[in-house]
């Protein structure tokens, strides 16, 4: 499978709500014996492998945001401290994977990188990842909501292993 | 019957090396996860590492750069080579086989002293 | 790095007690990665629990598992004579890295 970034980068007022998302593309496999971890976390440009570094999201690391489920199932954080800051990210069944921001403020600015791990545990993992741009700007040439441009099919698909 | 032995344990000096093996008998090495862990003298059990099915390999994070786990599947046994050991790798090393979401068989161990 | 935290470390109790064991792991583990192990001297481990509340083939249903997140017990309903041991946990992880960690271990003493 793949991860697409449908949207590579999201322009948002201060205050604002924003959701961040990724999407599983391709043949999933959905075994008993599968399992997904799926989490989110900040990085930044100019590495030589996108997303190689670990940095977290309003002080919550990887393993805070993290959900890990069966390959047939849904989840969402449903903890204090990922709500307390203002996080929840969240699972579907269709291979939507995202992160809720609330109350963005100007330090929320940056790279975020969704990882995806494929876990047939003992036999195999398969690691993915995608990577957006989150701008969050003030002032009046601040927009009144979010803006988000999609990604290149390219970019969208452009998968390097994490 | 399915059964791990390990074996060359022994002796060592420190900054010596040693290659531990893990035959199995009674079923396929090359179908399960095979890991080693070892218990010092009196103290609790300690993960070394694993080689999964797909021969991923993944070592706890002392054990980088000294152990190197291998399998060699037409002589269904399993290796951990020890390099730059020292007296606190002194231990009983088991090799353990993954089964399911565990491990589920393990050896008997062998004993490995480093000492002057 | 990835504790396994295990609790108390000694338990001393009498054949017919209710034993409790506690394992608390410092990030969260997927419960089906979660076992417990017995130990008696000069022996290997064995497999008691997995997927934190499953029973291994051979063990007898005195033995329980439970928890999930962090948070994992085994309890032994009553004590019998051969359970007299030492105890561990055990929890894989795959974040960042493949790790297995084992807990401390608790031992189960006669009173």
């Known amino acids: 499978f793949k991860v697409a970034t449908p949207y590579s980068l999201y322009v948002c007022p201060e205050g604002q709500n924003v959701t961040l998302t990724c999407r599983l593309l391709g043949p999933v496999d959905k075994g008993h014996d599968v399992t997904f971890y799926k989490t989110w976390y900040r990085s930044s440009r100019g590495e030589v492998q996108t997303c190689s570094e670990r940095r977290p999201i309003r002080n919550l690391t990887f393993q805070d945001l993290h959900l890990h489920h069966g390959g047939h199932q849904a989840a969402n954080t449903s903890h204090d401290l990922a709500q307390r800051h203002g996080l929840e990210s969240a699972s579907d069944h269709h291979g939507n994977f995202s992160i809720t921001m609330r109350n963005l403020t100007l330090l929320d600015s940056g790279l975020y990188c969704c990882l995806v791990v494929e876990i047939r545990h003992h036999h195999s993992e398969h690691r993915v990842h995608g990577a957006m741009e989150l701008q969050v700007q003030t002032g009046k040439d601040a927009p009144s909501n979010c803006v988000v441009y999609p990604s290149s099919s390219q970019d969208s698909e452009n998968i390097t292993a994490a | 019957e399915v059964q791990l032995v390990e074996s060359g344990g022994g002796l060592v000096q420190p900054g010596g090396s040693l290659r531990l093996s893990c035959a199995a008998s009674g079923f396929s090495l090359s179908s399960y996860a095979m890991g080693w862990v070892r218990q010092a003298p009196g103290k609790g059990l300690e993960w070394v590492g694993i080689i999964i099915v797909s021969g991923n390999i993944y070592y706890a994070s002392w054990a980088k750069g000294r152990f190197t786990i291998s399998r060699d599947n037409s002589k269904n046994t399993l290796y951990l080579q020890m390099n730059s050991l020292r007296a606190e790798d002194t231990a009983v090393y088991y090799c353990?086989?993954?089964?399911?979401?565990?491990?589920?068989?393990w050896g008997q161990g062998t004993l490995v002293t480093v000492s002057s | 790095e990835i504790v396994m935290t295990q609790s108390p470390a000694t338990l001393s109790l009498s054949p017919g007690e209710r034993a409790t064991l506690s394992c608390q792991a410092s990030?969260?583990?997927?419960?089906?990665?979660l076992a417990w192990y017995q130990q008696k001297p000069g022996q290997a481990p064995r497999l008691l629990i997995y997927s934190a509340s499953t029973l291994a083939s051979g063990i007898p249903a005195r033995f329980s598992g439970s928890g999930s997140g962090t948070d994992f017990t085994l309890t032994i309903s009553s004590l019998q004579p051969e359970d007299f041991a030492v105890y561990y946990c055990?929890?894989?992880?795959?974040?960042?890295?493949?790790?297995?960690?084992f807990g401390g271990g608790t031992k189960v003493e006669i009173k």
């Open positions: 353990a086989r993954g089964d399911g979401y565990t491990y589920g068989l």
């Open positions: 990030q969260s583990v997927y419960s089906r990665y």
């Open positions: 055990q929890g894989t992880f795959y974040i960042p890295d493949y790790i297995d960690g």
